[in-house]
């Protein structure tokens, strides 16, 4: 048993890192591998993370962390029973995959304009929670070519447009995602997404 | 081992106050993040409070927002929970309980609040 | 506040029956959610983390699925030791909210 992708995680900067690496060969990981995590600094522990079956040969382990700080750093070591499959090292810090944005609302009852708003995914005490910006997907349900991202790169989770520059009579859907520049973090998941019907006034033309 | 002992529970008056205790031992204290759990006779868990280890940020459930207070001493390896102006819904075993996400609870300390 | 509902509240079932306990968020927590079982005058422990990853020590027949609004505990087949309440927990965002407990009692 060899492992063919050494494992790559990504943190969320809060509660969850996320390990996931390739087997050579089809493997039940929950019964045949563990995934031992230990913080370093004198007198920590390790901590067990049976890992899950993410197609044939892939494995995903959640590691359960307490509340990251910059200088968090983790040994880790893959074991198949009594053998080292891999050891390596991790830092929530520098593999961050921020937590999806959440509560995505349109609110079409302000006049000509559509307002949508969400919430930021972090409490305000951490550090990401002042640091997240984040693009808007709006795409129509009826045309596959009418899909476009605002990208919102102001602290405030809420981004405002005209009604018209969507078609009016029509579904459109919209759904969030965030990144962190200060930590160079991948994208977020996007949030679910949320539908609305586009409809407005024309304005009265004068001849 | 790890362990958590909470004590400073027991009667007291509506509307009076009481200071519980939880001290630490096994593992470094300063380290982890704390909450308190509490159980109403009978009933389910409820999560009443959190504290930081990065930030020392905390937080409440709105049940008891503004009358309890968490703390820690992390040179005591203590955490407290600070209960003013108490009701008798407050009435609870109260836990202790570490982080991530309740890996390791205490006993529990009986608080009665009655007349 | 994010709601965790519970169901059912509670369940009569015999050693070596399929148990399914469903918790459903008030809104999208994607995978924050934890199972703890709770037996009589003892202290919660946990299950299962992160919707579905079983805790360490803990054994293979209990396992959680589900992400965003919907989730299940599942004991493969009940033992003797297993009858006791069950709670789901959100740490997606504070207040964290437990669901209200699933008491699994002897047919």
């Known amino acids: 048993m060899k492992v063919l992708q050494e494992p790559t995680c990504v943190s969320d900067y809060m509660s969850i890192s996320t390990c996931e690496w390739k087997m050579n060969g089809p493997t039940n990981c929950s019964t045949e591998l563990r995934l031992l995590y230990q913080l370093v600094f004198l007198l920590s522990e390790a901590h067990t993370c049976i890992p899950e079956n993410n197609g044939g040969a892939g494995c995903v382990c959640h590691l359960l962390m307490d509340d990251v700080v910059s200088a968090d750093n983790y040994t880790l070591d893959l074991w198949a029973g009594q053998q080292l499959l891999w050891k390596g090292s991790f830092k929530p810090s520098e593999h961050v995959k921020p937590r999806a944005p959440g509560n995505l609302t349109v609110h079409t009852n302000v006049s000509d304009t559509l307002l949508l708003t969400w919430s930021n995914p972090y409490p305000p005490d951490n550090y990401l929670y002042n640091h997240l910006t984040y693009a808007v997907n709006i795409w129509s349900e009826n045309d596959p070519a009418d899909f476009r991202i605002y990208n919102v790169t102001y602290l405030e989770p809420s981004l405002r447009i005209a009604a018209r520059t969507l078609k009016s009579g029509i579904s459109y859907r919209a759904r969030v995602r965030a990144w962190a520049q200060c930590y160079n973090t991948t994208w977020s998941e996007w949030s679910p997404s949320t539908k609305w019907h586009n409809s407005y006034r024309e304005p009265f033309e004068q001849h | 081992q790890v362990q958590l002992v909470e004590s400073g529970g027991g009667l007291v008056q509506p509307g009076g106050s009481l200071r519980l205790s939880c001290v630490a031992s096994?593992?470094?204290?300063?380290?982890?993040?704390m909450n308190w759990v509490r159980q109403a006779p009978g009933k389910g868990l409820e999560w009443v409070s959190y504290?930081?280890?990065?930030?020392?940020?905390?937080y409440y459930a709105d049940s008891v927002k503004g009358r309890f207070t968490i703390s820690r001493d992390n040179a005591k390896n203590s955490l407290y929970l600070q209960m003013n102006s108490l009701r008798d819904e407050d009435t609870a075993v109260y836990y202790c309980?570490?982080?991530?996400?309740?890996?390791?609870w205490g006993q529990g300390t009986l608080v009665t609040v009655s007349s | 506040d994010i709601q965790m509902t519970q169901s059912p509240s509670a369940m009569s079932a015999s050693v070596g029956d399929r148990v399914t306990i469903t918790c459903r968020a008030s809104?999208?927590?994607?995978?924050?959610l934890a199972w703890f079982q709770q037996k009589p005058g003892k202290v919660p422990t946990r299950l299962i983390y992160?919707?579905?990853s079983l805790q360490s020590g803990v054994p293979s027949r209990f396992s959680g699925s589900g992400s965003g609004t919907e989730f299940t505990l599942t004991i493969s087949s009940l033992q003797p030791e297993d009858f006791a309440t069950y709670y789901c927990?959100?740490?997606?965002?504070?207040?964290?909210?437990f669901g209200q407990g699933t008491k699994v009692e002897i047919k």
């Open positions: 809104q999208d927590i994607s995978n924050y």
């Open positions: 309980a570490r982080e991530p996400v309740f890996d390791y």
């Open positions: 096994g593992f470094t204290f300063s380290h982890s993040s």
């Open positions: 927990l959100q740490w997606s965002s504070y207040p964290r909210t």
């Open positions: 992160a919707a579905s």
């Open positions: 504290i930081s280890r990065a930030t020392g940020a905390v």
